[in-house]
């Protein structure tokens, strides 16, 4: 990475809303995120033909700070901030805004750095997009099978 890019964006404390999100709120956010996530993944796969299925990144999915199945917004958001300059910024911006609603006060934001190697970087982005899509499906299924 070039020296000029060593500008650490991380760790700002986030005052989460006092009220807990209801399952219906979480479902609504996930239903907004789902098409955006799928679209990004499909576009990326079209652009980067021949990339293997990736297990490069281990994107955190669920939050431990909740009784409900709850996406870990604090942990996932930095991945999307990291890949924004290498992806469709307008869709990523919408994802960032939705993920911000899913943040809990007690969860600090992780620091994510992009692999410098070209192939590794492409794998990293693919892994983030694939695992995020899978995470959304998993949480949506749990919400749908749980109490309404």
């Amino acid at each position: 990475m070039r020296g000029s890019h060593h500008h650490h964006h991380h760790g700002s404390s986030h005052m989460a809303p006092a009220h807990r999100l209801q399952p219906s709120d979480i479902r609504k956010i996930i239903l907004e995120l789902r098409p955006m996530s799928k679209g990004l993944l499909q576009d990326y796969l079209k652009k980067e033909i021949g990339l293997p299925e990736s297990n490069h990144s281990s994107l955190p999915c669920l939050s431990s700070d909740s009784q409900l199945p709850h996406i870990n917004g604090s942990a996932i958001l930095p991945y999307f901030r990291a890949i924004r300059p290498l992806s469709d910024k307008n869709t990523i911006d919408k994802i960032i805004e939705q993920l911000d609603k899913l943040k809990f006060q007690r969860e600090p934001e992780a620091k994510v750095s992009m692999p410098a190697d070209n192939f590794e970087r492409k794998n990293f982005i693919l892994a983030v997009l694939q695992q995020f899509s899978a995470c959304l499906e998993h949480v949506l299924q749990s919400l749908n099978s749980g109490p309404q």
Partner: antibody, heavy 121, light 111 residues
Framework: QVQLQQSGAELVKPGASVKLSCKAS????????INWVRQRPEQGLEWIGW????????KYNETFKGKATLTTDKSSSTAYMQLSRLTSEDSAVYFC??????????????WGQGTSVTVSS | DIVLTQSPASLAVSLGQRATISCRAS??????????MHWYQQKPGQPPKLLIY???NLESGIPARFSGSGSRTDFTLTINPVETDDVATYYC?????????FGAGTKLELK
């Protein structure tokens, strides 16, 4: 929708200081750089510096070090630029503009309307 | 610092014709396999408006008459066909390396 609202025009005396503001709305302020750009009359665009509201990190163009100081107030989603020891050379329109979200600089996709600063005795 | 040289400085094009503006960087603005070159339009008394980001991506809400191409050091903004509303000054800008720099601008007029 994303908006950056800048403070009004300033007429200041040589040697004085001025503090310009840029209030952001329509997005989560702390995740995006705020850039400041100068445009002198009938001239092009010059980048002054950026500030990342999340951690207060800043980077300045060498030309503006000691001239501009960038700060933010996360509670009001406002970025500020203080210009000190003003001379007639500092008479210009100053823009704030939203940048990227990561260590990789990106395009400035939303701009404030600009604040005109006139330095005159 | 990366110096951006825009050409021509001014350009007169007939309505409905193609306008081509060039931007040459003093060193490569590519990183991570992406060109960090962006194009803006500015009309008198207004702030710049992002048209194209990362060399070839059309910003949301910008008409498809605008397109960008190029990599490393040579970039082009094309407007085809030119409309009355396109009379403005166009700037290229690189974000690969601090300090961020702009080209001197190209003034587009109608013939």
């Amino acid at each position: 929708q994303v908006q950056l609202q800048q403070s009004g025009a300033e007429l200041v005396k040589p040697g004085a200081s001025v503090k310009l503001s840029c209030k952001a709305s329509g997005y989560t302020f702390k995740y995006y750089d705020i850039n400041w750009v100068r445009q002198r009359p009938e001239q092009g665009l010059e980048w002054i510096g950026w500030i990342f509201p999340g951690d207060g990190g800043t980077k300045y163009n060498e030309t503006f070090k000691g001239k501009a100081t960038l700060t933010t107030d996360k509670s009001s989603s406002t970025a500020y630029m203080q210009l000190s020891r003003l001379t007639s050379e500092d008479s210009a329109v100053y823009f704030c503009a939203r940048g990227g979200t990561s260590v990789i600089r990106d395009a400035m996709d939303y701009w404030g309307q600009g604040t005109s600063v006139t330095v005159s005795s | 610092d990366i110096v951006l040289t825009q050409s021509p400085a001014s350009l007169a094009v007939s309505l409905g014709q193609r306008a081509t503006i060039s931007c040459r960087a003093s060193e490569s603005v590519d990183n991570y396999g992406i060109s960090f070159m962006h194009w803006y339009q500015q009309k008198p008394g207004q702030p710049p408006k992002l048209l194209i980001y990362r060399a070839s991506n059309l910003e949301s809400g910008i008409p498809a008459r605008f397109s960008g191409s190029g990599s490393r050091t040579d970039f082009t903004l094309t407007i085809n066909p030119v409309e009355t509303d396109d009379v403005a000054t166009y700037y290229c800008q690189q974000s690969n390396k601090d300090p961020l720099t702009f080209g001197a601008g190209t003034k587009l007029e109608l013939k």
